[in-house]
Each structure stands twice: as structure tokens, then as C-alpha cells.
Interface confidence: low
């Protein structure tokens, strides 16, 4: 059977920022930090001041699906987490303001946010089988699962 998509005409409309200035820690208790201008990585920190603080914005799908769709922005910046392909690092994309409407190829800015207990997963809207993940000695990337770590704890009130 050939690939087929119902996603091409789905439009996502920005609703509001739902979380401010939180830290993401992976299952090894490593925090996400800035590796450079473009990439993120994970490291075990003694001082959480070095960790990246994120804001999370919620979007509503025109398809009215049950998933919580979010954008991730580095707090107090105009940098947004952007998916590439499997095993490729996520990029930090600079935009003048949070997009009001996202559709088509721009869905690489969006993630489905799932929670299971204290575990948080971020699946790429553009690549629904791939998660934001940390990988030893590598950037934060998109991955389908082990050996990459795909579950995160959200640490709030880190302003």
C-alpha cells in the first residue's frame, strides 16, 4: 500500500502559552542545555541555572484531534525547537514572533505532548513516529526509541 496522508490540509492555530520557564530532564536526570547557537544537548548538572528554560505554547488542530499539540520556545528568546529527520539534531529556529497559524511543512515546529505519570513525551507532528530524544555524546535529536532516551520530566517554577 502506498503512503497516504490526511495531514496536508490540517491547520494548527495558536491558543496560548501554557507553561513558562520549565526545565526538561531526561530519564538519566540529565538536563537539556545549549550546545551552541543551533543545537541542544543533555548533561548532568549540579547547577540548574545552566539548563535551558522552555516555554510551551498550545495549538488547536482544525481536525479537532485529541492530542495536545505544542510549540517549544527557549524562554526570553525568539528561538523555537524545530524537528528535522530521524537521528538528526533538532534545530533552534529564530522567528520574530510565535506563529499564529501552522500548516504543511511548518509542522516541524510542532510536537504532540503526551504524559504518562511523571513521564513526558514529545512526538514530532511532522514525523509522528519520532520523539524528541537525548542520546549519549550527541545532540538532542529525533529518535524512535532506545538507545535514545525519549521520556522527560518537566521541572517547573525554575525562573
Amino acid at each position: 500500500s502506498a503512503p497516504f496522508s490526511f495531514l496536508s490540509n490540517v491547520k494548527y492555530n495558536f491558543m496560548r502559552i501554557i507553561k513558562y520557564e520549565f526545565i526538561l530532564n531526561d530519564a538519566l536526570n540529565q538536563s537539556i542545555i545549549r550546545a551552541n547557537d543551533q543545537y541542544l544537548t543533555a548533561a548532568a548538572l549540579h547547577n540548574l541555572d545552566e539548563a535551558v528554560k522552555f516555554d510551551m505554547g498550545a495549538y488547536k488542530s482544525s481536525k479537532d484531534d485529541a492530542k495536545i499539540t505544542v510549540i517549544l520556545r527557549i524562554s526570553k528568546t525568539q528561538l523555537y525547537v524545530t524537528a528535522q529527520d530521524e537521528d538528526q539534531p533538532v534545530l533552534l529556529k529564530e522567528m520574530p514572533e510565535i506563529p499564529k497559524t501552522i500548516t504543511g511543512s511548518e509542522t516541524n515546529l510542532l510536537f504532540f505532548w503526551e504524559t504518562h505519570g511523571t513521564k513526558n513525551y514529545f512526538t514530532s507532528v511532522a514525523h509522528p513516529n519520532l520523539f524528541i530524544a537525548t542520546k549519549q555524546d550527541y545532540w538532542v535529536c529525533l529518535a524512535g526509541g532506545p538507545p535514545s532516551i525519549t521520556d522527560f520530566q518537566i521541572l517547573e517554577n525554575q525562573a
Partner: nanobody, 116 residues
């Protein structure tokens, strides 16, 4: 090789019920969202319902909301669609598909005919 094998279709009277099953193999079922789509005679593909990896999140087309229930058993690598209060307009070939709204594989389909 990815295989999706639907079963459970048949002829049912309006107002009746059917339960479709989809046996999945050739991939790690628990890692993927799954969906049902259908194709009525002479019509295009219509998305029916989706379910996430864990089964915690579901979504339905307006035309089936409140009548159909999607579920999955990850221990059996099986997807289900419980269809109640069936109507003539539900007559279609029902396909199980791998993905939430973008599908790289689907099965051969099972025919559901709603008629008195």
C-alpha cells in the same frame, strides 16, 4: 514485512453492531499510533478514528462520534473498532492503518454492509 490483517466485517441490519479487528505484525506495534479509515462504494478514503501508542488518546470523525469506539491491545498486537448503531451510510471497506493521520501502511480491508 509490515502486515495488517482486518477481520470482523459482514452484513448487518441498521441499528446493529459489529466489532472489527486488525492483527498487526512486522513492526513494533506498541511504538505506533494506529487508525481506521474507510472507503464507501464509489467514494474516496475517509478517516474514521485514531488511537495513540498507549491507547490513552483517541479521536473520531464527526460522522461516527458517539457510535464507534477504537481500542487496542498492545499485548496482542491488535487494533479494534467497535461499531454500534450502524447506519446505511457506514457501508464501506474498512482499513486498518499505521499512523495517526499520515499512513505508510494499511491492510487489505474488510467489507461492512449495513442493509435491511
Amino acid at each position: 514485512e509490515v502486515q495488517l490483517l482486518e477481520s470482523g466485517g459482514g452484513l448487518v441490519q441498521p441499528g446493529g453492531s459489529l466489532r472489527l479487528s486488525c492483527a498487526a505484525s512486522g513492526f513494533t506495534f506498541v511504538r505506533y499510533d494506529m487508525a481506521w479509515v474507510r472507503q464507501a462504494p464509489g467514494k474516496g478514503l475517509e478517516w474514521v478514528s485514531s488511537i495513540n501508542k498507549s491507547g490513552a488518546l483517541t479521536s473520531y470523525a464527526d460522522s461516527v462520534k458517539g457510535r464507534f469506539t477504537i481500542s487496542r491491545d498492545n499485548s496482542k498486537n491488535t487494533l479494534y473498532l467497535q461499531m454500534n448503531s450502524l447506519r446505511a451510510e457506514d457501508t464501506a471497506v474498512y482499513y486498518c492503518a499505521k499512523g495517526w493521520a499520515s499512513f505508510d501502511y494499511w491492510g487489505q480491508g474488510t467489507l461492512v454492509t449495513v442493509s435491511s
